[in-house]
Structure formats: C-alpha cells, structure tokens
C-alpha cells in the first residue's frame, strides 16, 4: 500500500555539520510499529544512511554508532544527521514503513537536498 511522505526540498547543514529536517507521513491510522529509513542518493547511487524502528508513542532508537538521531510526534519524525562534510552533500530520502498492524504500508519522500559546506580553517594568528 502506498503512503504519501512529505519532507523539505532543501536544508543547509550547520557549520558543525549537522542537518535537521521533518519527515511527515500521511498515515491511514495509528500504526503501532513504524520503521524510518534515511537513504542518500548521489551520482545515481542510493545508500542507506540510517534506520530505526519505533513503537508508536516511544522514541526512535538508532544504533549507537549511527549518525542519525530523531524524535517522533504523531505522524511526524524529526530527523537529525550529524558529522556531515562537504562530500556528504546529496539528496536524503525519507522512507517510512508501517510494519504493524497489517497491512504493510510504504511511503517514500521526494528527498531533501542537504548542502554541506566545510568550514574555512581559521587563519594562524600572530597574537
């Protein structure tokens, strides 16, 4: 079953390499188990950045070594990706799956273009 997923078109990462965006899905009701995956598309290649399964009403739990964190509220997931560098610039796609109860629903957003600009190194100071 297809499900609409909305996410912002463009986000600019902070100078510390952190980017946040909201992924909203048009749920037909209250799924008790939801899986959220962030995919990165660059040069026609798609790679999985991170994924989390959460029970409705609970926090998203990404793996300990994940570069993603997130919180959920109703049909919205607030995603934060950290440790980004200029080479990580690309289209970040939010994929939402309603895992339980059945039937299974899948929604894939159009993607958020995240621009990352590496900070200029501070010039040496004589003072």
């Amino acid at each position: 079953k297809a499900m609409h997923v909305a996410q912002p078109a463009v986000v600019l990462a902070s100078s510390r390499g952190i980017a946040s965006f909201v992924c909203e899905y048009a749920s037909p009701g209250k799924a008790t188990e939801v899986r959220v995956t962030v995919l990165r598309q660059a040069d026609s290649q798609v790679t999985e950045v991170c994924a989390a399964t959460y029970m409705m009403g609970n926090e998203l739990t990404f793996l300990d070594d994940s570069i993603c964190t997130g919180t959920s509220s109703g049909n919205q997931v607030n995603l934060t990706i950290q440790g980004l560098r200029a080479m990580d610039t690309g289209l970040y796609i939010c994929k939402v799956e309603l895992m339980y109860p059945p039937p299974y629903y899948l929604g894939i957003g159009n993607g958020t273009q995240i621009y990352v600009i590496d900070p200029e190194p501070c010039p040496d100071s004589d003072f």
Epitope: P28, G29, K30, T32, P101
Partner: antibody
Framework: DVQLQESGQGLVKPSQSLSLTCSVT?????????WNWIRQFPGNKLEWLGY???????YYNPSLKNRISITRDTSKNQFFLKLNSVTSEDTATYFC???????????WGQGTTLTVSS | DIVMTQSQKFMSTSVGDSVSVTCKAS??????VAWYQQKPGQSPKPLIY???YRYSGVPDRFTGSGSGTDFTLTISNVQSEDLAEYFC?????????FGAGTKLELK
Amino acid sequence: DVQLQESGQGLVKPSQSLSLTCSVTGYSITSGYYWNWIRQFPGNKLEWLGYIGYDGSNYYNPSLKNRISITRDTSKNQFFLKLNSVTSEDTATYFCARNYYSGYFDFWGQGTTLTVSS
Amino acid sequence: DIVMTQSQKFMSTSVGDSVSVTCKASQNVGTYVAWYQQKPGQSPKPLIYSTSYRYSGVPDRFTGSGSGTDFTLTISNVQSEDLAEYFCHQYDTYPLTFGAGTKLELK
C-alpha cells in the same frame, strides 16, 4: 476494488436481538485492517459501534455496554453484528466499513435500514 | 469520549463560491481527523484524512487544515455536486467519534 455489502433484518421487535451480516469482496478480512459497524440515526448522527480485527480481536463502543457482539466467518469472508435487547433508540441505518487500526474509514457498505417497532 | 462539534448545521453557498466547514474537538486529537461527504441515500465517502491529505480521486478544490482541536474543510469553487452533508471524524482515540454534520445548501 474492495466492496462491502450489508444484509439482515429490516424490522425487529423491542427487546429482541438484531443480526446483520457484512459480506466483503476484493480483500480477505484476515489479511489486515479492522472491520467495523457504524450506525446513522434519523437526523444523520453517526455512531461507531465496534470492530473485529484481521486477527479476530474486538473492541466495542462502551456506550453499548454488554449488548453488542461482532463475530466473523473467515471461510465466507463475512463479519456480523449482533445487538441484544433493542429499543426504538436502535432504529438507524447500519453501515459496515473498513479502517486501518485507529484510522479513518476508507470503504463503506451502502447501509441497511433497521427499524425497531412492535 | 471525544466530542467533535460542528457548530453550523447548515451552510448556504453559491456555485463558484468558497466555503469553510469547521469542526472543534473537545481535546487534542493531533492530526488524526478525517472528513466525509454524504449525499442522500448514500454512504459517507472519504474526502480528507490525516487533517490535510486528499483521499484518492478527490478534486483539489477540497482542502483540509488544522491541528490539535480546530479543523477546517474548505471547498473552493463550489460545484453543484458538492451540495451534500459533511462530517468530521476523529480517529485519535477509541471510541472513534464523528461530528453532527454540516449540510451545504444553495443560497
């Protein structure tokens, strides 16, 4: 496409039980979703009565106390409403409808009118 | 139970006009609100779900908005086939409940 069709008595005497059937085509009631009964009183007020889930689970509107039972026959892809001790207050059009858990109703039957009268 | 209040039982409009039907929930229901259209002798048909998402095949002149306790269904460029009764519905909490309906009539 999914279709739901109600059938059953049109006239019931007070204090008796009403029994209605919802026949589903185009989707197996055991594959997913929740299968509901909703009624619409004269004047058009809608009231959700209860559901039977794809897994056989039930939940009923507390306003109906212990008068309601929703069951199913998976071999016929049908589910049923039984309402005991009816009064004239139960006169309404009864709809069956499908929803995702705690969700909106995407498919409805055409409704069957039930009158409680002696 | 959550009470969904549609304060206007009737609304008058003209073809080509824009009209807004409102619904107020007795407690916060987030965005778990749907709108249905019902014509005489027919079952309710879903128009909007999750507050603002149009159901498949629904014309884009129907838009939904709101969150929390206040919700609106707006019909722009009203057509004669839009003359019907409109119900809001909360699916945040069981028992699921409906508004009393707003009937759209011609002026």
